[in-house]
């Protein structure tokens, strides 16, 4: 049967007819009263005190109702949920997880966690509504966990019209042996000792330290993994791991050569509710690779939206060549990652200058054959782009990928709905193709015009008559992503370069070829 | 650090392939570089492969002739060399790339003789 | 392919006084993303090469402060302010902004 159910929007919490909770109200010490009245929220300001007993977890403020039993949490930056249970910056879980206490919400399937409150969970032996929830880290949220001790995070998604424990794609903190960092490398604790210059870290008890904050005198060293050695640390929260070194006899500290453990390609996918033509309304947080291209003109005022890019590396954005016709200089192009409306700002999103950015030399206007670009973007030190929830970036494929025919794929853009449509979408949108064999990606099959090696085809085979609202990208979506999965994560096969038109049945949409360009995006990313 | 350990000598006939291997340790996510050096002369870059991907990229010289590989859960990389002939006698380095190559294999002698 | 020429093909020189290698080549190396990658090697009698300078000025960890590189465009210099018995070998010029990467012809340097 269904059920009225009502979102907070603000927490992501979710909650049945008449059912009341208290929100605390952002940035300010007022306290919200919501009932959930035939799928709203309806909401109203109520004086609190302080709470007779401790109740929120790591250093929450504890608020309760004057006139009823209810109580509230102000969680402290980077904790979330009913008690601050939640640690919104894990970005990986040590062990089998047991303690993992993040936000991730995507099975190994790509499906999206169903909330552990969920009535549909009532009967599972694990769900929100037991007497331990808090301790097993379960409560309102969807987020994976693993409260019996299993291998790893999971977490209940409906598949084949029931709902079934699936493991999650969150990231592990330690790979093996692989000597990385996650997040900006704080809880890095491997060996590297090379600074990005080549130079030979200096052991952080040396004596050429004294006066130093950071050296193995530290009181608290040991915590921040310092000692008798020259391993590369982060103890202060910087952008990465770094070291002290010796420069032209100068003491002075660079960041280190240590990879980051890689998290491309893994998302928190949401299902889109809204249909649009040409695809389906989508939230960042499911694209987070999606980059938004704005440039300054000459002879108008302000930013227009330019074209869609594609987060590769921290600093390196991807595009089409025939989105920079127009030879801009570097610094009249912005580079937004992290936004779900096209024009609105994101609260996480992260915005960059551009330090330069590199046409393929053999880019041809005509054909559009090598539609590839590179971006750079502007910041002070070897870090650009801050992983997030919203900000990630695409795998590389493998030079030897080749998935099969018509195995379905995505693309994303903030491009029009369609081909005569005179506006951009105001939201960021997705669209599901599949990939043409390459005996249907030919010039016959795109009147006539050249489809060169470099190239590979993508469209909606759905059937349907002139109402069919067939998926294809769109102007304005140039630039941007054409992913698939691939070893469990999201992997980038084709940048959107062309078409004719915008969702016509047997048309498939163009695309450059990524794997024939992986040793000139390397090459062109060199230090 | 980098360190690159190279399989050992090679004596093969005109016409036969050989394939030297590389093994990696430290940080292993770099480009790798083939380069040869046959007696007294100097030396000759072949071509590069990046480890994770796998992408190659050949000196038109060699163009057909060679293939660089990789294993990433080994983390060796392969040069194959087909087609042999006495000219192709030499030392073979890999080299490790970054910012230039600052890490070498001790290099492996290839014979090729009848 | 571009060449890289190198001068002279030998050096002879005393220890303590300074030495200068000249590299040039056929065409531009400022690679399409602006950098310009200009490296000088040695390699020692029986060694594999070694870096000693990358990108035309850039000292490689552990390289002594008597080297340094300079140059560009097409001409680019390798000196060593005070030669020192254990600087003999070959040294090699290098470009890696143009596929194919192409290494100069070497310079000996051999002490008098």
């Known amino acids: 049967s269904y059920q009225v159910i009502c979102r907070d929007e603000k927490t992501q919490m979710i909650y049945q007819q008449h059912q009341s909770w208290l929100r605390p109200v952002l940035r300010s010490n007022r306290v919200e009263y919501c009932w959930c009245n035939s799928g709203r929220a309806q909401c109203h300001s109520v004086p609190v005190k302080s709470c007779s007993e401790p109740r929120c977890f790591n250093g929450g403020t504890c608020q309760q109702a004057l006139y009823f039993s209810d109580f509230v949490c102000q969680c402290p930056e980077g904790f979330a949920g009913k008690c601050c249970e939640i640690d919104t910056r894990a970005t990986c879980y040590e062990d089998q997880g047991i303690s993992y206490r993040g936000t991730w919400s995507t099975a190994e399937s790509g499906a999206e966690c169903t909330n552990w409150n969920s009535s549909a969970l009532a009967q599972k032996p694990y769900s929100g509504r037991r007497p331990d929830a808090i301790r097993l880290g379960l409560g309102n949220h969807n987020y994976c966990r693993n409260p019996d001790r299993d291998s790893k995070p999971w977490c209940y998604v409906f598949k084949a019209g029931k709902y079934s424990s699936e493991f999650c794609s969150t990231p592990a903190c330690s790979e093996g042996n692989s000597d990385c960092y996650f997040g900006n490398g704080s809880a890095y604790r491997g060996t590297h000792s090379l600074t990005e210059s080549g130079a030979s870290c200096l052991p952080w008890n040396s004596m050429i330290l004294i006066g130093k904050v950071y050296t193995a005198q530290n009181p608290s060293a040991q915590a921040l993994g310092l000692g008798k050695h020259n391993y590369c640390r982060n103890p202060d929260g910087d952008a990465k791991p770094w070291c002290h070194v010796l420069k032209n006899r100068r003491l002075t500290w660079e960041y280190c050569d240590v990879p980051s453990c890689s998290t491309c390609g893994l998302r928190q996918y949401s299902q889109p509710q809204f249909r649009i033509k040409g695809g389906l309304f989508a939230d960042i947080a499911s694209h987070p690779w999606q980059a938004a291209i704005f440039a300054k003109h000459r002879r108008s005022p302000g930013e227009r939206f330019l074209c869609g890019g594609i987060l590769i590396s921290s600093c390196w954005i991807l595009s089409a060549a025939h989105c920079f016709q127009e030879r801009f200089p570097p610094h009249h192009l912005t580079v937004i990652l992290g936004r779900t409306y096209r024009v609105v700002p994101g609260e996480e999103e992260q915005k960059f200058e551009v330090e330069k950015y590199i046409v393929h030399k053999e880019f041809d206007d005509d054909t559009y054959d090598n539609d590839i670009a590179l971006l750079q973007l502007k910041s002070d030190s070897s870090r650009c782009a801050q992983e997030s929830s919203v900000v990630r970036t695409v795998c590389l494929p493998p030079a030897d990928l080749q998935l099969p025919d018509w195995t379905e794929c995505e693309l994303s853009g903030y491009g029009k709905h369609e081909a005569l449509s005179p506006f951009y979408s105001e939201r960021l949108k997705e669209a599901h193709v599949r990939l043409y064999p390459s005996s249907r990606c030919t010039s016959q099959h795109l009147l006539n015009r050249t489809v060169t090696d470099n190239m590979l085809c993508a469209g909606d085979t759905r059937s349907g008559g002139p109402q069919a609202n067939l998926h294809d990208a769109c102007q304005g979506d140039s630039g941007g992503p054409l992913v698939c999965l691939n070893d469990g994560r999201m992997t980038l096969v084709g940048i959107i370069s062309w078409g004719l038109g915008c969702g016509q049945k047997d048309v498939p949409g163009v695309y450059t070829k990524v794997t024939n360009y992986l040793d000139w995006i390397r090459d062109n990313m060199r230090p | 650090q980098v360190q690159l350990v190279q399989s050992g000598a090679e004596v093969k006939k005109p016409g036969a392939s050989v394939k030297v291997s590389c093994k990696a340790s430290?940080?292993?996510?770099?480009?790798i570089n083939w380069v040869r050096q046959a007696t007294g002369q100097g030396l000759e870059w072949m071509g590069r492969?990046?480890?994770?991907?796998?992408?190659?990229g050949y000196a038109q010289k060699f163009q057909g002739r060679v293939t660089m590989t990789r294993d990433t859960s080994i983390s060796t990389a392969y040069m194959e060399l087909s087609s042999l002939r006495s000219e192709d006698t030499a030392v073979y380095y890999c080299?490790?790339?970054?910012?230039?190559?600052?890490?070498w294999g001790q290099g492996t002698l290839v014979t090729v003789s009848s | 392919d571009v060449v890289m020429t190198q001068s002279p093909l030998s050096l002879p020189v005393t220890p303590g006084e300074p030495a200068s290698i000249s590299c040039r080549s056929s065409q531009s190396i400022v690679h399409s993303n602006g950098n310009t990658y200009l490296d000088w090697y040695l390699q020692k009698p029986g060694q594999s090469p070694q870096l000693l300078i990358y990108k035309v000025s850039n000292r490689a960890s552990g390289v002594p402060d008597r080297f340094s590189g300079s140059g560009s465009g097409t001409d680019f210099t390798l000196k060593i302010s005070r030669v020192e018995a254990e600087d003999v070998g070959v040294y090699y010029c290098f470009q890696g902004s143009h596929v194919p990467w192409t290494f100069g012809g070497g310079t000996k340097v051999e002490i008098k």
């Open positions: 080299a490790s790339y970054y910012y230039a190559m600052a890490y």
């Open positions: 492969i990046d480890p994770g991907g796998g992408s190659t």
């Open positions: 430290g940080n292993t996510s770099y480009w």
